[in-house]
């Protein structure tokens, strides 16, 4: 029960991570016109990954494309690829953990594969997390770089008399989002590994154990407790004695109707 | 075709009040920003407020801050200009205005005369 | 507040000539994000509201005849009227609107000579 709770949650967190950080490597937000101290503008700059936009106070926005490959700085283009690394891992992740789930069965997948293909979904999602939290930090790192950057020549004076406005840029929403994305990705996939070890726990084996009803000597070989990391070929629940108490994880699914969208 | 028609305007003592209205028609009035402009007689144009649309931001000259206060009714597509503690220098003519691309007044009204005298 | 000085303050022309008004902003209009400046130019005819000719510097109104344009970049900027015409005599106002407050220029009296 535990463990399809433990998978089912992490596939879930992981699934809502990813949704989040698509959300933010589409979002214009990744930085805003810094309005404090700021004289009031008429006019809001705001920038995403792919474009920049302008928001006027007249309701009018535009928003043009970044419509060049090497114009563009290094550091965006390390951004781009992190969040479409992220989404992919994410993706490939949430493709395998949806076939990993102990709630579905397809054919007759044994449990030693769910645990492969739990545990390979769950490293995808903590990859892609990391990925989402590493590019959204470089950005954020940028920002703030730029930001006092600008702020030490925030009034560029001409001749004493003319004034220019540098425009200074601070965290959009996008950052937020992309954070708490990928920490909710990277929960799921520790959620997904944890819940790996359950599905293919610690093997033992009681081997080579003799009773003899005659005498009195009883012989007992020792057959080693073989531990398993269940990843191994050999990760078939051997049990010898059963308590008479089963937990839902034990209990045998049979093939079922399933709608999974 | 975009029409702005304002009312309210007339004589009234210093320190009296006075609203404003403003009827917009033929056009989105809700997602439009709209404005009030002054004209003093004989003299150039002064800008008086602002009111966006969707949050309703709302921007004053200095002039009239604390004295005047914008807002909107979306339902019945009406810009307000209420009036307080008029002096001799509100004394003009006030334009209901809709501002556009590059926040630029593209649509004005006719005007309602304003005098604040005793 | 940004002061928006326009010049001259008055000017006498015959139809057919070039009008050139000048407006001088004591701040950059110009916007970094979208590279636009935010200055509109009006037309104020006697007992008239006024009307839009230019935005963003140098976008003409549609409607506007296209012997009005617009020119300039940051803090200076001109409003040219190819050939005058009769009908042009009017208020010519400049407007900043990339600062609250959206403050307007004295304007320009343009008559015939």
């Known amino acids: 029960m535990a463990v399809t709770a433990c998978q089912g949650l992490g596939f879930v967190v992981s699934l809502i991570g990813i949704a989040g950080i698509i959300a933010a490597t589409c979002m214009d937000q990744w930085s805003t016109q810094d309005l404090y101290n700021n004289p009031v503008t008429a006019v809001f700059n705001y920038q995403g990954l792919w474009r920049s936009c302008v928001r006027e106070s007249s309701g009018f926005t535009e928003c043009r494309g970044y419509f060049t490959l090497l114009g563009l700085p290094a550091m965006l283009q390390a951004v781009r690829a992190l969040m479409i690394v992220g989404i992919v891992l994410g993706a490939i992740g949430l493709l395998v953990s949806i076939f990993a789930l102990k709630c579905i069965r397809i054919g007759s997948m044994e449990d030693s594969a769910k645990a492969n293909m739990t545990l390979t979904s769950g490293i995808m999602f903590i990859v892609s997390g990391l990925c989402a939290i590493a590019g959204v930090s470089v950005f954020a790192n940028m920002l703030v770089t730029n930001f006092w950057m600008s702020t030490a020549n925030m009034y560029t004076g001409m001749g004493g008399m003319v004034q220019t406005v540098q425009t200074r840029y601070t965290f959009g929403a996008a950052l937020f989002v992309g954070w708490v994305a990928g920490g909710l990705t990277l929960i799921g996939g520790v959620m997904m590994c944890i819940a790996c070890r359950g599905l293919a726990p610690e093997e033992t084996n009681y081997k080579a154990v003799s009773y003899h009803a005659s005498g009195h000597s009883v012989a007992y070989k020792p057959g080693g407790f073989k531990a398993s990391t269940g990843f191994g070929s050999n990760t078939k629940n051997k049990k010898i004695y059963d308590g008479g108490a089963r937990t839902e994880d034990e209990v045998q699914s049979y093939p079922s109707k399933h709608d999974y969208v | 075709e975009v029409q702005l028609v304002e009312s309210g305007g007339g004589l009234v003592k210093p320190g009296g009040s006075l609203r404003l209205s403003c009827a917009a028609s033929?056009?989105?009035?809700?997602?439009?920003?709209v404005s009030w402009v002054r004209q003093a007689p004989g003299k150039g144009l002064e800008w008086v407020s602002t009111?966006?649309?969707?949050?309703?931001?709302?921007y004053y000259a200095d002039s009239v801050k604390g004295r005047f206060t914008i807002s909107r009714d979306n339902a019945k597509n009406s810009l307000y200009l209420q009036m307080n503690s008029l002096r001799a220098e509100d004394t003009a003519v006030y334009y209901c205005?809709?501002?556009?691309?590059?926040?630029?007044?593209?649509?004005w009204g006719q005007g309602t005369s304003v005098t604040v005298s005793s | 507040d940004i002061v928006m000085t326009q010049s001259p303050s008055s000017l006498s022309v015959s139809p057919g000539e070039r009008v050139t008004i000048s407006c001088k902003s004591s701040?950059?209009?110009?916007?970094?994000?979208?590279?636009?400046?935010?200055l509109a130019w009006y037309q104020q005819k006697p007992g008239q509201p006024p009307k839009l000719l230019i935005y963003?510097?140098?976008t003409r109104e549609s409607g506007v005849p296209d012997r009005f344009s617009g020119s300039g970049s940051g803090t200076d900027f001109t409003l040219t009227i190819s050939s005058l015409q009769a009908e042009d005599v009017a208020v010519y106002y400049c407007?900043?609107?990339?600062?609250?407050?959206?403050?307007f220029g004295a304007g320009t009296k343009l008559e015939l000579k």
């Open positions: 205005t809709r501002q556009f691309k590059g926040n630029a007044l593209d649509y």
């Open positions: 033929g056009f989105t009035f809700s997602n439009s920003a």
């Open positions: 009111i966006t649309s969707g949050v309703s931001y709302t």
């Open positions: 701040q950059s209009l110009l916007n970094s994000g979208n590279q636009k400046n935010y």
């Open positions: 963003w510097a140098s």
């Open positions: 407007q900043n609107d990339y600062f609250y407050p959206l403050t």
